[in-house]
């Protein structure tokens, strides 16, 4: 059962698996949630009554029951770890602590001239947890304006104490807001020769690679495969670090692999859910229960269920046995990963599904595309939505994409002559515009978000938000499509679509099915001699075949041009101007989404 | 009917510098692009740049870029052309045209040009 | 730059012959080419646009042709006030350039 309430003055007694210091019951809550057993928590905050030592523990715990005996205690407050919730979760902390001192190694210090400054330097440092910043009224002259910026084991400060005149709070790489460059690469018969923080067991490179991410400390890992030669290793995940935050030495060999931290792609792909199935491999581990089920998939959804299930080995049933069931253990241990890896024994294995809701839903995979055609299928584009206007009398507007469960992100100037968000309506989960009828469920729009630097589409910025009266339950036919990272600003997108209801050509009327085209990206040199009297800035990007004939064209306004990577699909760009439609040359040009994310998450997150 | 009408003949001396008005009539000023091209005497036609008046926005030919300033007051509909430290073979009619396209394409309507003779 | 070589120079042709002028592309230019006549102390008037679309009010007697690099203008029934300069331009890719021209003379 979830619960999200906060229970005051109450202490829960036993089940203690380890302490942490955190600034908040809140953040505690959050801590419990992705500790890989923590199903219950007691924060103490500060008192009188209290001893100042015992400020801010958050004492994490567990129980084979899902609960614990509860104790009236003053200034304790206690809760549940949102394991047990269906709901999204996210880490993100933007919260700033006043006259809060967090404790941690002190490894670089600068002037900054705001905490908000010292909060930046921190989300784009590496090895950055957690920063401490003197403001300008600190007593000690030469401390003032200081911003301390630090790190520990387990990415929670290692005391907290009271401190006036200073603020703290935590890296927001967390909150997609990093700089940092995005590394998808996984490097073959490579070891990374670096100090190791922690090991644990992995049936493949990638699961790895997303421990690794979820790893306060580690930066990049390395990995042996099970035909490693030295069997002890095998399946072994190696989270390391190194002072620079890239690796010192690769070495060449043979069946091992290595990688990096995806701590600033995470928004876009997913680094908690581990979702594939693992064929004659059994997972080790501490026996939680045994039950029968009728396939490897049904066991992972028995262990998706039981909320401390972390991982399961689920062996099929011998010929006519139990019903033709097979036999599900369902497994844990003191990290969330197996304590063994075996191969050879018939077993499937899996882990929880648990953690998904860790991931962006965005991330999801989506059914296969249809190749060829330009008529789209059901479920094919499930973030795109088509905007009305019901003024003077119903019509399709723009295209627009989810990106939240309240949100869409669509053009500024879709909105032209718009008076009031009252006459738009957001349709969802459609494939034909026919389908639209009076007794149609749609969302209405509480509020139009425009970039207050958009003027006209040409001139960029053409980029709006609408916030949605309702909340969009995400099925397969709606749901969000992720944002671009800030690390892959480099990426080269190379499998691009855009779709739309739009005209197919000039002077055309609005399609009935929704249109797809694959189209080239363009770049912003060779876009810029396409339109010589507008400045194609790096807030654009430019798509469009040489030889014309697909693009974007009136009423795809707005809609997306999405380009998959990764096996994940991401919002690049929004379709905003050009000249005609599918003009011979002139590329189609979109506001550029990767540098608006910021300035989405600010309005999108906002309190 | 769309018109552009430039301003008189100009007389300059090497080093000075010139600058050519272009209005514009019977159209939406800020939809379409102002170029500028130029024809010395007896010679073919060069492309000196582009004004977007809607957007303020300017591109150049290189062989121009560090003397030639293109800018447009929308209030009254004009375009100007300066071209700043003048040498004899900058003598040329110059002339401004609307393209046909709304992002630059062919120039459909031409200014009468205006004639600029530089000589000490 | 893109470079637009003219060709020929100049060309007389009888009344009510065909005229032909040639214009090559030192890059392909895909289709975006126009072509303008000139006559002395006149601004240059727009004939074709995009290798083949007569503008607003041109003679069906004048045609555009053409792909890539190499373009065409045909004038199939010359008449005495087709005299006058044709320059073709390309606008492919900023800057627009012009070709040299081409001189155009009854015989």
């Known amino acids: 059962e979830c619960v999200t309430q906060l229970l005051k003055d109450t202490c829960f007694e036993g089940g203690d698996i380890t302490t942490v210091f955190t600034p908040s019951a809140k953040y505690c809550q959050v801590v419990c949630t992705y500790h890989p057993r923590c199903l219950l928590f007691t924060f103490t905050a500060e008192s009188p009554s209290e001893d100042p030592t015992r400020w801010f523990t958050c004492v994490l715990k567990d129980s084979v029951t899902e609960t614990l005996p509860r104790v009236n205690r003053t200034a304790a407050i206690s809760g549940y770890s949102f394991k047990q919730c269906s709901h999204q979760i996210s880490a993100c902390n933007k919260d700033i602590y006043v006259d809060l001192d967090m404790k941690g190694i002190n490894y670089n210090s600068s002037v900054a001239k705001s905490a908000q400054e010292c909060q930046e330097r921190c989300t784009d440092d590496v090895h950055c947890h957690f920063f401490t910043y003197a403001t300008r009224q600190f007593p000690s002259l030469e401390h003032r304006n200081i911003c301390l910026l630090k790190h520990t084991q387990t990415g929670t400060p290692t005391r907290i104490t009271k401190l006036d005149k200073v603020v703290s709070g935590f890296s927001l790489k967390s909150c997609a807001l990093s700089n940092l460059a995005c590394i998808r690469d996984i490097f073959p018969n490579t070891v990374f020769a670096d100090s190791n923080i922690d090991s644990v067991m992995a049936p493949d490179a990638f699961v790895c690679g997303r421990i690794c991410t979820h790893h306060p400390g580690c930066l990049f890992f390395t990995f042996f495969s099970q035909e490693w030669p030295k069997e002890s290793q095998r399946n072994l995940c190696l989270l390391k670090t190194s002072e620079s935050g890239l690796p010192s030495t690769r070495i060449k060999k043979s069946k091992a692999l290595s990688g990096f931290s995806l701590q600033s792609c995470r928004h876009s792909i997913p680094v908690f859910c581990h979702s594939s199935f693992y064929h004659d491999t059994d997972f080790l581990g501490e026996e939680l229960d045994i039950v029968a089920a009728k396939s490897h998939e049904a066991c992972q959804k028995l262990c998706t269920n039981a909320v401390r299930c972390q991982f399961f080995t689920y062996t099929p049933a011998q010929a006519s046995c139990n019903e033709g069931k097979g036999k599900c253990y369902l497994k844990l241990s003191s990290n969330g990963s197996p304590t063994k890896i075996l191969h050879g024994r018939g077993g499937i294995s899996g882990y929880t599904l648990r953690l998904c809701k860790m991931d962006n839903e965005c991330t999801t995979k989506i059914k296969p595309r249809i190749v060829g055609g330009t008529a789209s299928v059901r479920g094919e584009w499930p973030w795109q939505v088509t905007l009305h206007t019901t003024s003077p009398t119903q019509r399709h507007l723009c295209g627009g994409s989810i990106i939240g469960n309240q949100w869409i992100l669509t053009a500024a100037h879709c909105f032209y002559g718009v008076e009031s968000p009252k006459i738009l309506r957001v349709y969802s989960g459609i494939l034909n515009q026919s389908e639209i009828k009076e007794d149609t469920s749609f969302f209405g729009v509480q509020e139009i978000i425009i970039h207050d630097q958009y003027k006209m589409a040409e001139s960029g910025y053409d980029i709006a938000l609408l916030k949605l009266e309702t909340t969009v339950n995400y099925t397969d036919s709606q749901r969000p499509i992720c944002l671009p990272s800030k690390g892959d600003r480099n990426v080269i997108y190379t499998d691009c679509w855009v779709t739309g209801w739009g005209y197919r050509k000039l002077r055309d009327k609005i399609q009935n099915t929704l249109q797809k085209a694959k189209i080239p990206l363009v770049t912003n040199e060779e876009c810029q001699k396409r339109y010589r009297g507008h400045k194609i800035t790096h807030k654009m990007i430019c798509a469009g075949y040489r030889e014309g004939g697909k693009d974007a064209c009136k009423g795809d306004s707005g809609g997306p041009l999405s380009c998959k990577h990764n096996e994940v699909w991401h919002l690049v760009g929004i379709t905003s101007w050009g000249e005609g439609c599918a003009q011979r040359e002139r590329p189609g040009v979109y506001t550029n989404v990767v540098e608006y994310v910021d300035w989405i998450l600010e309005k999108t997150q906002a309190v | 009917q769309v018109q552009l009408v430039q301003s008189g003949a100009e007389v300059k001396k090497p080093g000075a510098s010139v600058k050519v008005s272009c209005k514009a009539s019977?159209?939406?000023?800020?939809?379409?692009?102002i170029e500028w091209v130029r024809q010395a005497p007896g010679q073919g036609l060069e492309w000196i740049g582009v004004?977007?008046?809607?957007?303020?926005?300017?591109n150049y030919n290189e062989n121009f870029k560090d003397r030639a300033t293109l800018t447009a007051d929308t209030s009254i509909s004009t375009a100007y052309m300066e071209l700043s430290r003048l040498r004899s073979d900058d003598t040329a009619v110059y002339f401004c045209?609307?393209?046909?396209?709304?992002?630059?394409?062919?120039?459909?309507?031409w200014g009468q040009g205006t004639t600029v003779t530089v000589s000490s | 730059d893109i470079v637009m070589t003219q060709s020929p120079d100049s060309l007389a042709v009888s009344l009510g012959e065909r005229a032909t002028i040639n214009c090559k592309a030192s890059?392909?230019?895909?289709?975006?080419v126009a072509w303008y006549q000139q006559k002395p102390g006149q601004p240059p008037k727009l004939l074709i646009y995009?290798?083949?679309n007569r503008y607003t009010g041109v003679p069906d007697r004048f045609s555009g042709s053409g792909s890539g690099t190499d373009f065409t203008l045909t004038i199939s029934s010359l008449q005495a006030e087709d005299v006058a300069v044709y320059y073709c331009?390309?606008?492919?890719?900023?800057?627009?350039?012009f070709g040299g021209g081409t001189k155009l003379e009854i015989k």
């Open positions: 045209a609307r393209t046909y396209g709304k992002y630059g394409g062919a120039m459909d309507f």
């Open positions: 019977g159209y939406t000023f800020t939809n379409y692009l």
């Open positions: 004004i977007n008046p809607g957007s303020g926005y300017t």
């Open positions: 890059q392909s230019v895909s289709n975006d």
């Open positions: 995009y290798i083949s």
């Open positions: 331009q390309q606008d492919y890719s900023s800057p627009p350039t």
